[in-house]
């Protein structure tokens, strides 16, 4: 006696006692025709006719994955025994949003975990969350198709004044973080050099406090603080900034020696190393990548290399001695 003995008769499924031979036989020596795969799926071992007892495997198109039991079995009556199987999207489709909103990055499909940022033209802010993440096959939080841009209260208040200021008669005065910032304004990730900590702050409050000469506050990036390369670079950039000879106001930010203020986005964008001008006496002795040789670079080159996330160790300020 062998527990494996089955006289060669295949079972339909592990959890079924019936064997193929026990099924009522209907005239169908021809087997089974090709089954219909679920939407966005296809038959892996595709052919015109399948033998009784033969399995077909359901596969899904790129961007979809099988949910359920993905095998169909050909029964003697010429039909298929199939469990519930479907092809579920594993990516999110680019959301349909109102034309006034800009999606960054702009792609047709987004992988799970990828995020998008919605932005508005200058002087307007998104009337709701601006950051969305692809989870499963949908966006979190859900993106409302009525989502639009609204006039930025900061812009309304400031009149002809700079950000963080408001018009008072014919002159510009700093906004009060308490009195002038009760309205909604977009979130910024901010670093406080005094407390050596970063936190999320409404744009209005950050700009008002910066105007009131709180020099210890540094803009890191738009959106709430989230661990990752953007935050990491923001912090490193703040450390490097103390030696920068250039400090150019740009939207919420201040651009340094290794950056240019983008006129269209009012954001500081890192230059690429070849765009650095040689001038300046802010020099550093560095080691590049896994190289053992030392190199003298100016602050612009150091900033661009670190911004590009290339490996570089700063040995000391000033020229290399060798």
């Amino acid at each position: 006696f062998s527990i494996m003995e089955n006289n060669g008769q295949p079972c339909i499924n592990d959890d079924e006692e019936m064997k193929e031979v026990d099924l009522p036989e209907i005239e169908a020596d021809s087997g089974c025709p090709q089954p219909v795969p679920p939407e966005n799926g296809f038959i892996r071992n595709e052919k015109q006719l399948y033998l009784v007892g033969e399995d077909v495997e359901i596969s899904c198109l790129t961007g979809f994955e099988t949910v359920g039991y993905q095998y169909f079995r050909c029964l003697p009556d010429g039909t298929w025994r199939q469990g519930d199987v479907e092809c579920q999207r594993t990516e999110c489709i680019k959301p349909v949003v109102q034309e006034v909103l800009t999606i960054t990055p702009f792609q047709r499909l987004y992988r799970i975990g990828e995020s998008i940022e919605l932005t508005c033209p200058k002087g307007f802010v998104v009337a709701g969350p601006s950051r969305y993440t692809c989870q499963g096959n949908s966006w979190t939080p859900p993106i409302s198709n009525s989502l639009t841009c609204e006039k930025d209260t900061l812009t309304k208040l400031k009149g002809h004044c700079q950000l963080g200021q408001k018009q008072s008669g014919s002159e510009c005065i700093c906004m009060s973080p308490e009195e002038d910032c009760s309205h909604h304004s977009e979130d910024l990730c901010v670093f406080d050099t005094d407390s050596n900590d970063y936190f999320t702050s409404p744009a209005c409050k950050f700009l008002a406090e910066k105007c009131l000469n709180n020099q210890q506050l540094h803009f890191l990036h738009i959106g709430s603080c989230q661990d990752g390369r953007q935050l990491e670079w923001g912090l490193e950039r703040t450390r490097l900034s103390s030696n920068s000879t250039k400090k150019e106001s740009c939207g919420y930010d201040t651009c340094y020696d290794w950056e240019k203020c983008s006129a269209s986005t009012s954001k500081c964008v890192c230059l690429l190393p070849p765009q650095c001008f040689k001038g300046g006496n802010q020099l550093y002795c560095v080691k590049m990548g896994s190289s053992t040789s030392e190199k003298t670079l100016n602050i612009c080159e150091v900033g661009t290399i670190r911004c590009a996330n290339r490996k570089m160790e700063i040995l000391h300020p000033g020229k290399c001695l060798a």
């Epitope: 964008v269 070849p274 650095c276 001008f277 001038g279």
Partner: antibody, heavy 118, light 112 residues
């Protein structure tokens, strides 16, 4: 006014060598990285090589590594491209380019034609 | 290497009418700190290329404001609001987000 003038192009046999020059004027040459960009006849543009201010760092596209050498002489306000083991696919107009804070290739010379043929 | 694909390859435009060129990259040009290094150049007949647009949407020095750039990730567009006779030539997109820097194959603009 920034001016870049290339010279040294011509007809050369496969396997041969050629040295291109670029004379720069209208700016402090030693303050800028410089680059070579090429354009095959009737084709698109292709970055070839870049050099830093003093020539201590050079960067090349994979297909020319080991065959081409970019160099500069700051005293003469000149950029060079020494091309060895030339191939038919190196046939192109070679442009000398200078960056600005706007772009890597903000200023271009008029180009010099290199033809590699037997 | 990143492949830059431009469409259409040639374009016949009417003076005073708008024109648009698309450029698609084989990989996202948005880097991990949020910067996108995408440029547009115009090469007029018999001339060397000239910079039109840098960083996706910033206008190069001395470039007329009828030119504009937009897009993000892998899809970018150059628009001319009103084509003029002097706009003829070959338009190239170029990326510098990933080494080596690569150009599109070019789009030839002609005037009807």
């Amino acid at each position: 006014e920034v001016q870049l003038v290339e010279s040294g192009g011509g007809l050369v046999q496969p396997g041969g060598s050629l040295k291109l020059s670029c004379a720069a004027s209208g700016f402090t040459f030693s303050d800028y990285y410089m680059a070579w960009v090429r354009q095959a006849p009737g084709k698109g543009l292709e970055w070839v090589a870049t050099i830093n201010y003093d020539g201590s760092s050079t960067y090349y596209r994979e297909s020319v590594k080991g065959r081409f050498t970019i160099s500069r002489d700051n005293a003469k306000n000149s950029l060079y491209l020494q091309m060895n083991s030339l191939r038919a696919e190196d046939t192109a107009v070679y442009y000398c380019a200078r960056p600005s804070t706007e772009a890597l290739f903000a200023y271009w010379g008029h180009g010099t034609l290199v033809t590699v043929s037997s | 290497d990143i492949v830059m694909t431009q469409t259409p390859l040639s374009l016949s435009a009417t003076p005073g009418q708008p024109a648009s060129i698309s450029c698609r990259s084989s990989q996202s040009l948005l880097n991990d700190v949020g910067n996108t290094y995408l440029y547009w150049y115009l090469q007029k007949p018999g001339q060397s290329p000239q910079l039109l647009i840098y960083l996706v949407s910033d206008l190069g020095s001395g470039v007329p404001d009828r030119f504009s750039g937009s897009g993000s990730g892998t899809d970018f567009t150059l628009k001319i609001s009103r084509v003029e006779a002097e706009d003829v030539g070959i338009y190239y997109c170029m990326q510098a987000s990933h080494a080596p820097y690569t150009f599109g194959q070019g789009t030839k603009l002609e005037i009807k």
